[in-house]
Amino acid sequence: TPEVWVQVQMEATELSSFTVHCGFLGPGSISLVTVSWGGPDGAGGTKLAVLHPELGTRQWAPARQARWETQSSISLALEDSGASSPFANTTFCCKFASFPEGSWESCGSLPPSSDPGLSAPPTPVPILRAD
């Protein structure tokens, strides 16, 4: 059964910058990745980026750059323009649509004790209930 992992890290150089990394572990070909914050896509979350392996990417503020890292993982850079960072306590969710297995989603947030530049290891996370 496919699994999705999510990790969020604060950039060491810029405390207002965060990066969300997401990956898909499983068979099938990925046809779409959707990244949202504040909850899952379609269940209270707000879309930040959509990545299609052939048609390209779309992103919405405060997303700065969405890109494929490998054939089965992506990264999304976020820029917080405000004085205080809202990202630290925010949940980020990644949904991978894979053919023919379907859609698989997981959510994550910055670990509470995170030092800038450090992040949780990219261990597989089972599909999480978000509601």
Epitope: T1, S29, A97, P100, E101, G102, S103, P126, I127, D131
Partner: antibody, heavy 120, light 107 residues
């Protein structure tokens, strides 16, 4: 409004083939996978297979891999299913259903069904 | 293949009743459980996806719950238009499989 309009009922002879259609409207056809489901009279639902309209990739239930062929025509936003070597066991209502593209992997919109009767 | 079992094939209730329909999977399906209704004319509609999320346009009297292998659909205040057959479906693995259905009738 999402709609899936299926072709009308058919009566066919044993051994023949039949090709039914499912015309999609109200959404971008290539953005959502399409499922096909069989319902024999008074019985439950059986999943036949799924097709990705974007590239035509298919995946079938082993039970139906030699019975059904799924195709799409992107220009008309239409999905097709062809059933071959028909027998009385193939008499049923066949539904197309759009994949929700969401966790749970539900089928969020369904066609009205195409009734197939196999009789000599 | 994962077997989906709806032990109650038919259920009678009165308008206004709270009705619960159950579904069991032959293995853990991690909330990848969906509920549909089929009207007597054959029309099929999605009610609940991912165990408990309400599909758009579905009245709030419908709710879903469960985890692991056991799931349920609840109709909190039965209305005449709810008379239908209800199916569960797992979206956890291929092939997708459905329960046998529970036909809901009015007393």
């Amino acid at each position: 409004e999402v709609q899936l309009q299926q072709s009308g009922p058919v009566l066919v002879k044993p051994g023949a083939s039949v090709k039914m259609s499912c015309k999609a409207s109200g959404y971008i056809f290539t953005d959502y996978y399409m499922h096909w489901v069989k319902q024999s009279h008074g019985k439950s639902l059986e999943w036949i297979g799924i097709i990705n309209p974007y590239n035509g990739d298919t995946s079938y239930n082993q039970k139906f891999k030699d019975k059904a062929t799924l195709t799409v025509d992107k220009s008309s936003s239409t999905a097709y299913m062809e059933l071959n070597s028909l027998t009385s066991e193939d008499s049923a209502v066949y539904y197309c259903a759009r994949d929700s593209s969401n966790v749970g992997n539900a089928m969020d919109y369904w066609g009205q069904g195409t009734s197939v009767t196999v009789s000599s | 293949d994962i077997q989906m079992t709806q032990t109650t094939s038919s259920l009678s209730a009165s308008l206004g009743d709270r009705v619960t329909i159950s579904c069991r999977a032959s293995q853990d399906i991690s909330n990848y459980l969906n509920w549909y209704l089929q009207k007597p004319d054959g029309t099929i509609k999605l009610l609940i996806y991912y165990s408990s999320r309400l599909h758009s346009g579905v009245p709030s009297r419908f709710s879903g719950s469960g985890s692991g292998t056991d799931y349920s659909l609840t109709i909190s205040n039965l209305e005449q238009e709810d008379i239908a057959t209800y199916f569960c479906q797992q979206g956890y693995t291929l092939p997708r499989t459905f329960g046998g259905g529970t036909k809901l009738e009015i007393i």
